[in-house]
Structure formats: C-alpha cells, structure tokens
Amino acid sequence: HSDPARRGELSVCDSISEWVTAADKKTAVDMSGGTVTVLEKVPVSKGQLKQYFYETKCNPMGYTKEGCRGIDKRHWNSQCRTTQSYVRALTMDSKKRIGWRFIRIDTSCVCTLTIKRGR
Amino acid sequence: HSDPARRGELSVCDSISEWVTAADKKTAVDMSGGTVTVLEKVPVSKGQLKQYFYETKCNPMGYTKEGCRGIDKRHWNSQCRTTQSYVRALTMDSKKRIGWRFIRIDTSCVCTLTIKRGR
C-alpha cells in the first residue's frame, strides 16, 4: 500500500492496514452474500500455508473520522468509508462444503460526498 | 465493492473495477519488489482453477482525472491515485521457482492532497 506522506502528500482519508489471518477472521461473506468459515490452513503443493489477508480500513482514531480532509465544506458533506474487494480464500459453507470462494475483505478507505441542500 | 451512488452519494474519485485473469496479468511485483510470472492455473484438490484477481483503479475516463471531486481548491491541489494491496498468488520467480507469493494488485482509487503554497 503506497504511502502518500512519503511524497509530502496527505490522504483525504486516513487508513490503517494490517495482515489478518484466518484464525482471527474466522468467517467472511462470499460473493453470493452467504457467511462462510475461513479455513486456517491451506494445503498447497506438498505443504500447507496459513491463510493471510492484507486488510485496509478507515482509521477510527484518525483525524478524518469526522469527515474527509480538504473538502469544500460550503458545498459538500463528506464521510470516510471503508470499501471492500474480493479475494479468493479456502472456505467452508454452511453445508460443510469446502472450496475456494471469493470473499469480501476491507481493502481501502475512500471519501464519499453528499451535496449540501438548502444553503 | 460497495457503490456509494446507490445511497445518493458521490465518490471523491471515480474508479473502475474488473476481474483480471493471470493470462491477462502475466507478471506482477511481489513483496520484495521482484517481478514474478503469475501462473494461469492453480492446482486444487479436484482439478485446477484459473487465477482471477478483482482489481480496482482510477477511471482514466472519469470526471476526476483532472483532480478530486469536492476539494477546497483554494487551499489544496488534489489528485486521484490508484493504490495497491497484496494478494497471494501462485507465481514463478526469475529462477523458475514456483511458489505462493504475495503480489501487488490495484485495489482502490483514493484522493491525495498537497497544500497550495504562496497564494
């Protein structure tokens, strides 16, 4: 995840990123909206790996928890919002079927705007 | 990827998302900064899967290609920038070693700011 601060830039929304294992995630939502169990171990070619996910979300302790940085407040209301993406993970569904499914994970913190009415 | 427009909201930066196969991706950058070849198919317990990645980047045709939406232009310069995250993929390195590595993929479009000097 590139760091704009290194280039003397500021993000409109502050985010935090961390690696999350299946042991901590436990469940996730798949593409059909169903809740699945995320398996801790992934059998790979002659071995096993721990499932890790790189997750990014809005920083609840950050400056931008009250709204986005740098917004024209005369015209806009703003909010930093965590967005999600899909990654493939080894999972088990409610019927105990194990398989590779795309699950939703937190992946970014973006700014959304609503226009100010009745000024 | 949630759609703010559904809630009567606008994004500060316009993005586009698409599914990308390893066949289209071909190479990627791993966590150590090395270029690796992304293998098209992954062996799984009952056959093989095509490697797919869900990628999101700034929309080059969007309104926000000249700068972010809703920014206070008196105080800030702005730019929409594609950010990256990590996903695990079956890859081959320059020494022909095949293994699961974390690679960088485009995952979001965020707004970065620089303060306007000498107004």
Partner: antibody, heavy 118, light 108 residues
Amino acid sequence: DVQLVESGGGVVRPGESLRLSCAASGFTFSSFYMNWVRQAPGKGLEWVSGISGRGGGTDYADSVKGRFTISRDNSKNTLYLQMNSLRAEDTAIYYCAKETLNIFFDYWGLGTLVTVSS
Amino acid sequence: EIVLTQSPGTLSLSPGERATLSCRASQPINRYLAWYQQKPGQAPRLLIYDASTRATGIPARFSGSGSGTEFTLTISSLQSEDFAVYYCQQYYDWPPLTFGGGTKVEIK
C-alpha cells in the same frame, strides 16, 4: 528497527508458576503471529507456542499443552507466556520470535532464562 | 511430527575453507525449510528460507539447496564470524514447527 525484549525469567521450584513477557517494537505487532521458542542449556531449539495476530488462534507443543498459556496485548505491543506446573525439563532460555507470513522466524529476542530447580 | 536430522554434529574447519552442512527430513517437505545461525550468548538469526532464498542482509557466501528430504547449507569460504551453531527448521507441516539438532562449525 524490529526489537523484541523478553523479561520475567528467574529461578522457581517445580510446580510453581512464572509469567514471561516480550515487548515488541519496530513493526505492526497486531499483524503477525508471535511465538515462543526455548533452548535448554547446551541443547537445540524447541518451538513452544504460537499465537495469531489478534489472538484468535493459538498452538502449543505437546510438551507444554495444558500447562502453558500464550496471550498478547496488542495495545501494549506485548506477548506473554503464562507457565504453570513448571518442571525441571522446562529449564531453558525462552526466546520470543516474530513469524513471517510463511511460518519461519525473521526476528528473535535475546531470550530470558527460566530455571526450575528444587 | 516431522523430525529433522542434522549432520555432522560438529564440523572442524579453517577460515577460508568451504563448509557443507546437511539436514535430512523424516518425510518429504518440498522446499519448506529455513536455516538459522546462532552464536554463543546470542539469539538465532535467519539465514535462508524456502530452502535456497537468502534472507535480507545475508552475505552471498551462504547458500542453500535441496528439496524433499535432503537439504544442504553451504558456506563457500568461512570467515571468522561464521563459526557458530547452525539449525534447520521445517514449516511444511505444523504444529509443531520443528528444528534440527544443530551443527556446530568450529575453528580447526
């Protein structure tokens, strides 16, 4: 720079308890599995226990299962090992080790010595 | 549990000589093997992972090879700071993560 500093070692009698701590700095502590590895005097390395980044998953060597408990406090960037019902064979230097995403150890502390003797 | 057997137990060599250390696994572990160096009174230090990839900052004189059950750590030309104990570790099947018994490289 990554730093791991263990503390809490000492001399105890068989059957007694001890709590080890490992203060971590220089990396996003909550992102990584952390482990305890021990080394009996003049012997090799033995993996003892591991815990996932947010504490949801724990593993133990059979030799300590039921007696030792691994835990972490991410707000303090600290790893713990609660050791109960200690035995003479638990005498060792206990190292705290950071696990990589691929399950080997890229950083180790200097260790803390635990001596169990009557 | 996968057992790793290291040989020889002790290797007596002179500076400038080539050191060849062996690690044998009780069952195939693909390339899921790491090597560590430990000097007296110090913590272990990661040298090699995935059987042959050097860790950050490790000199090119250290190299790893092997796959399956037979692995080798080679130090092409021993420097004074290389005299230490070397351990292999498997991460193919866990828990438990297991280490070899170690090989001591001493000055002849």
